[in-house]
Each structure stands twice: as C-alpha cells, then as structure tokens.
C-alpha cells in the first residue's frame, strides 16, 4: 500500500463576503484510519475549523457524505464568509491514537482571500459654517473592504476636484481595510445648491461605484447685503423707510430698527423670498412720524445673521 497523501488542489480561493467558500481536500487512502481536521494557519497557534469526529461546527458542511464507504473526499464548505475568515487553510489527516489522535499528514494549504465591499462612503463637512471665498475641508470614510486596492474621487457639482489627500489603512496585510480622504473646497456665493460627492470604486462593486454626498447648504453662510431707502411721504407727517436685506443664507436672521441709536422695533425674518441660487431676500419697513422729531433723524437697519456679529446700514431722515 502506498502511503496516504493529502491533496489540496487549490492553492488559493477567492470568495465574496457573505458567500460560501469551498475548500477542497482528498486523501489517497483510507489507511491509517483517523479523522481529517481543518485548520486555519499553521503551528501551535493554528485555529481549528472542522474536526470530522469531535465537536460541532455550525458554519461548516462537508461536500460529500463522510459516512459513505471508501469516502476520501474531505472537502468542506464554510458559510457566510467575512473578511475575518481570510487566511491559509490546511487539511490535516490524523492517525487514530490512544488517548489522543496523532497528526499524520497535512495538505499544502489553500489561501482563502475574501472580497468584501466597502461600506457606503460617509462625507462630513466642517463643524461651523464658512463664508464664500473661504476654503473648507470635507472628509470621506469607507470601511471593511478587501482587497486593499481602491480608488476614491471627489466631485463638486460634477466637476472633479484635485485638492485632496487619501489614506488606506492599515498599511500592512489585513483582513479588511479602511479609506479616509480629506478634500479642500473653496466656497462661492453660488454654492447653496452645490453638492460635494465622494466616489469610491472597488473590484467588488462591478464598475458601479459607491457615492457619499454632502450638501454645501449645510456648510455655507452667505452674509446679506443691506440697502436702506426712504419712500415718498405716505400720509401727512409719515415717512416710510425700507431696509432691503438681500442674498443671505441660511434664513436665520433678526433685524432691529434704531432711531437715533434707540431701538424702535425688532423682528425675525419670516416671509422671505428665495432667489434662484438658493439665497434669500427680505424687506422690512419702518413708518416714521416726522412731526415727533424737531431735528434730523438717523435711522439704522441692524441685522444679525445666523448668530454672527451684527451688520448695519443707516439713513439720515431730513426733517424740514
């Protein structure tokens, strides 16, 4: 009789995460009698994956019926593969021993590589809003992919960005990887409706990249421009003064009228009109009783926008 050999025909097997891995192994003889065991890794720290005789291994099924006479096929299937299952698997024949079985012969090993899809990219912007002409940073993160090779691109409104830095971790061998990228974006007044997109391409995605988006509306603050104008006298001794608050974003705005430095009225922007670019316009008016004033009146429209320091515009009202 020729001595038993353990044959693992596949040097490597590539499986997608969530699927089933088939690890093939055959023996060339029934003798010596004893169990086949599967291990991940070699040496004293190896991990037992399956023992034909002892223990329960719910994720593992055998390809053939091991109880069939003359069975020499000890191939196994491992279900619901995750990146953590990657490694080299050895089919090892043991000789029945008393009290313990004795390792007899090992197969050459099969390297299991797991293809895992990256998680949906998550794009996050700065904690505080910034105004046009400022440069802001956006980060994009995606995790759990394998193999390591991955491509990340940034876009703003469909235009590819070039000012970004990307890292894939860890640098060395790992069961799965993460990508982290930071892009720099210069804001413009027209960016309320703009989007920043992070696009991740990986072999597991079959040419259909994953995208994460951030709306610049959550990042930008467009400060208002103010214009105070005096309208013709509406009624006897009454002058209508308007304050046009234009092109601001976001909507959160409080306006205060001052007469000669004294607060006359405070109101919060409510019925605003929206511009095509996503900014808002609002108008406030003040009816001034001229007869109540002997001297010229300095009217000030003071606007506090989105919690920022107030901006103001004044108008001198002539009392003739």
């Amino acid at each position: 009789e020729e001595e038993l050999q353990v044959i693992q025909p596949d040097k490597s097997v590539l499986v997608a995460a969530g699927e089933t891995a088939t690890l093939r192994c055959t023996a060339t003889s029934l003798i010596p009698v004893g169990p086949i065991q599967w291990f991940r890794g070699a040496g004293p720290g190896r991990e037992l994956i399956y023992n034909q005789k002892e223990g329960h291994f719910p994720r593992v099924t055998t390809v053939s019926d091991l109880t069939k006479r003359n069975n020499m096929d000890f191939s196994i299937r491992i279900g619901n593969i995750t990146p953590a299952d990657a490694g080299t698997y050895y089919c090892v024949k043991f000789r029945k021993g008393s009290p313990d079985d004795v390792e007899f012969k090992s197969g050459a090993g099969t390297e299991l590589s797991v293809r895992a899809k990256p998680s949906a990219p998550v794009v996050s912007g700065p904690a505080a809003r910034a105004t046009p002409q400022h440069t802001v940073s956006f980060t994009c993160e995606s995790h759990g992919f394998s193999p390591r090779d991955i491509t990340l691109k940034w876009f703003k409104n469909g235009n590819e960005l070039s000012d970004f830095q990307t890292n894939v971790d860890p640098v060395g061998e790992s069961v799965s990887y993460s990508i982290h990228s930071t892009a720099k974006v210069v804001l413009t007044r027209e960016d309320v409706h703009s989007q920043v997109i992070c696009e991740v391409a990986h072999v597991t995605l079959q040419g259909d990249p994953l995208r994460g988006t951030a709306n610049l509306s959550e990042t930008i603050r467009v400060p208002p421009t103010l214009e105070v104008t005096q309208q013709p006298v509406r009624a006897e001794n009454q002058v209508n003064v308007t304050c046009q608050v234009r092109k601001f974003y976001p909507q959160r705005l409080q306006l205060t009228w001052l007469e000669n430095g004294n607060v006359s009225r405070t109101e919060t922007a409510s019925t605003v009109t929206e511009n095509k670019d996503g900014t808002y316009n609002w108008m406030s008016w003040l009816l001034v009783n001229v007869s109540a004033h002997r001297d010229d009146v300095k009217l000030t429209c003071q606007v506090e926008h989105d919690g920022q320091p107030a901006v103001s515009k004044s108008h001198d009202l002539k009392v003739s």
Epitope: L30, I31, V33, Q52, K53, E54, G55, H56, D65, L66, T67, K68, R69, N70, K96
Partner: antibody, heavy 121, light 111 residues
Framework: EVKLEESGGGLMQPGGSMKLSCVAS????????MNWVRQSPEKGLEWVAE??????????HYAESVKGRFTISRDDSKSSVYLQMNNLRAEDTGIYYC????????????WGQGTTLTVSS | DIVLTQSPASLAVSLGQRATISCRAS??????????MYWYQQKPGQPPKLLIY???NLESGVPARFSGSGSGTDFTLNIHPVEEEDAATYYC?????????FGGGTKLEIK
C-alpha cells in the same frame, strides 16, 4: 476517556418487552454510528442493530432475527442509544453490548461492559 | 449473510512462539481495494477489544506482535511472539455488507 455504560437488563418472560439504554461519554456522540451486539454461549457474538447519524436521517439496520421486534434509537442531546425489545424470545438471552462504530464501517473500537438479558419462563 | 468460519476452534502455543488463526468468508469482503475484516480479542468477563482493522492495520495501542493479513475471502491473524497475556478468545468480523457477522471464535491457550 471514552465510556459506554449499558443498563436495563434483567430477567424477562417470553413475549415480554424491555428497553436497554446506553449512555456515552468522552466523545462527540452525535458524530458516530452506534450499534448493539449480543453474545451468548449458543450463538457467540451476534450483531443486532445499528443507528446512523442525523445527516443519514438516523438510518437503522437490523439483524434478520430481530427485525420487526427490536427498535434502535438515539438521543444525541443525551448522548444515549436505546434498544427497545418487544415479543422477547428465549434465544434473545445474552449479554448486550453497546458499541461505537469509529469509521462508519462496523469498526467497533469501543464496547461497553454489557448488560445481561435473560428470557425465561 | 456472509458466514465467517474460524479455525482452529482452539490452539495451544508455547510462550514466545507464533500463533496463527484463520478466518474464511463465504463471500469476498473486499471492495475498492480494501478488505473489510476486523479482529478482536476477548478475555473472560470483558467485552471484545479491537486488534486489527481493514484486515492488516494495527489498532492504536495494540502491541506490534499482532498482525493481520489476507484479502477477498481468506484472512489470518498472527501473534508472534506469544505472551502470557495473549491467552484469550479471538474473533474475526466483517463489514463487507449488512448484516455484519462474527466468526465462531478461536480460543488461544499459552503452554
């Protein structure tokens, strides 16, 4: 350490019923076929019955002499195998051994100490 | 059923000599190049103990003075050199097909 311990033997009258039990320890019971073999001075060693694994749908096989009268069963959660014997005859007398089949081929590597059944009026 | 005939029914062998026990099957117990024959030793008050599996392979923990040979229908158990503790009854058993059957036994006495 592998152990097989039979119980349930005794003296029975012909036509009676008896159930033998065997509790296993020291190995993963559910991974092994189990057998009953009996021994008497008249017939020597005689294989009686076999029960296979859950994956074999607990298939059972019997010697012709006990077919229809004996039933082998197992409870993997209790690591136990049983032999229900009905319509007992004098020729069923003997020592009944509970046996582990190591390699699914009547490879009887571990035997219990046996339990004695006597069928006599 | 396959009938196994053992011979001799008993034998006496001097310490250190060779004991040879024969087992003949009424039909071949060989398939796919393997011989489904087993040998057991039984001492009084004890269950049988497996010595040889698949005709010629020594069960773990069994001394190397026990050996098995044969194929098809003719099989032999050899014990050499015989020791005092080998006094027992020896049985052959097949698993060529169902039902499994045993030989009638050979009683070995040590002189």
């Amino acid at each position: 350490e592998v152990k097989l311990e039979e119980s349930g033997g005794g003296l029975m009258q012909p036509g009676g019923s008896m159930k033998l039990s065997c509790v296993a320890s020291g190995f993963t019971f559910s991974n092994y076929w189990m057998n009953w073999v009996r021994q008497s001075p008249e017939k020597g060693l005689e294989w009686v019955a076999e029960i296979r694994l859950k994956s074999n749908n607990y298939a059972t096989h019997y010697a012709e002499s006990v077919k229809g009268r004996f039933t082998i069963s197992r409870d993997d959660s209790k690591s136990s195998v049983y032999l229900q014997m009905n319509n007992l005859r004098a020729e069923d007398t003997g020592i009944y051994y509970c046996i582990r089949d190591y390699d699914y081929d009547a490879y009887f590597d571990y035997w219990g100490q046996g339990t004695t059944l006597t069928v006599s009026s | 059923d396959i009938v196994l005939t053992q011979s001799p029914a008993s034998l006496a062998v001097s310490l250190g000599q060779r004991a040879t026990i024969s087992c003949r099957a009424s039909k071949s117990v060989s398939t796919s190049g393997y011989n489904y024959m087993y040998w057991y030793q039984q001492k009084p008050g004890q269950p049988p103990k497996l010595l040889i599996y698949l005709a010629s392979n020594l069960e773990s923990g069994v001394p190397a003075r026990f050996s098995g040979s044969g194929s098809g229908t003719d099989f032999t158990l050899n014990i050499h050199p015989v020791e005092e503790e080998d006094a027992a009854t020896y049985y052959c058993q097949h698993s060529g097909e169902l039902p499994y059957t045993f030989g009638g036994g050979t009683k070995l006495e040590i002189k």
